[in-house]
Interface confidence: low
Amino acid sequence: MVPPPENVRMNSVNFKNILQWESPAFAKRNLTFTAQYLSYRIFQDKCTSTTLTECDFSSLSKYGDHTLRVRAEFADEHSDWVNITFCPVDDTIIGPPGMQVEVLADSLHMRFLAPKIENEYETWTMKNVYNSWTYNVQYWKNGTDEKFQITPQYDFEVLRNLEPWTTYCVQVQGFLPDRNKTGEWSEPVCEKTTSDETVPS
């Protein structure tokens, strides 16, 4: 009897859906693996007799529950299937958005870029999938612990009347209010304000 794959899980970020597993702990031979997905009541092969311990399911529909399964094989023998259920739109991790920050006197002007979706049109982003998509922004004076958070209404935001000649750090995450779901924070971007004199328009 071939032991089944262990630690089977879906690693999904921005709808790049990678089913991952580990070779059975005490397998003393080189196993191969087959991974399948349920389509209209019939299981279809996605990765067949692969020596890898992962399989890319990014082409799955983003909506609805999917049943995936994987088994280990050796020669004419095989293990039992290990099943998992996965709903991309609910389960995928929202990766960090992009952010552009520009200093204009005592203001920080920020523009946010929703993460791109894998295996989709070049312009397709997470914002196209989630109707409620918005951003959480947090900012703080560099070197202090006190963080302030805002929820911009648009893909851009301006923090005005900041202290001049002071370094502020900003980071952003995706936020889905209707799902109460937050994404990963972007790396902080730190910029120094200049004077508080009026900037000519």
């Epitope: 302030f148 958070q149 805002i150 209404q153 301006v158 936020f175 109460n180």
Partner: nanobody, 123 residues
Framework: QVQLVESGGGLVQSGGSLRLSCVAS????????IGWFRQAPGKEREGVAC??????????NYIDSVRGRFTISRDNAKNTVYLQMNKLKPDDTAIYYC??????????????WGQGTQVTVSS
């Protein structure tokens, strides 16, 4: 250190209205979110409404059970946030807390909390 003081709670009949106020002192930025959470007897604390006042206007979030009945607003000049509660129901009975950095209403992971004000709705 930010300090938050709530007021305006009380006993009201079902269908009635109350207006809660929260005055923030030591509050250093009008950009920070501020809002209201509540805790009913024997239940976990939950977010009610949260407001951010940003460089491009105001954005408010509400939990579904109060949307359309409660309105959150803020007056940055007075460092005060308000919760206008209309069409109150017995289910709204709870201690209402003011809190900063409240943007995620599903978890009471705000940074600073007031002492709370009791709201009781009788049927």
């Amino acid at each position: 250190q930010v300090q938050l003081v709530e007021s305006g709670g009380g006993l009201v009949q079902s269908g009635g209205s109350l207006r809660l106020s929260c005055v923030a002192s030591g509050f250093t930025s009008p950009y920070s979110t501020i809002g209201w959470f509540r805790q009913a007897p024997g239940k976990e604390r939950e977010g009610v409404a949260c407001i951010s006042s940003s460089g491009r206007g105001v954005n408010a979030n509400y939990i579904d059970s109060v949307r359309g009945r409660f309105t959150i607003s803020r007056d940055n000049a007075k460092n005060t946030v308000y919760l206008q509660m209309n069409k109150l129901k017995p289910d709204d009975t709870a201690i209402y807390y003011c809190a900063t950095n409240c943007w995620r209403l599903t978890s009471p992971a705000a940074d600073n909390w007031g002492q709370g004000t009791q709201v009781t709705v009788s049927s």
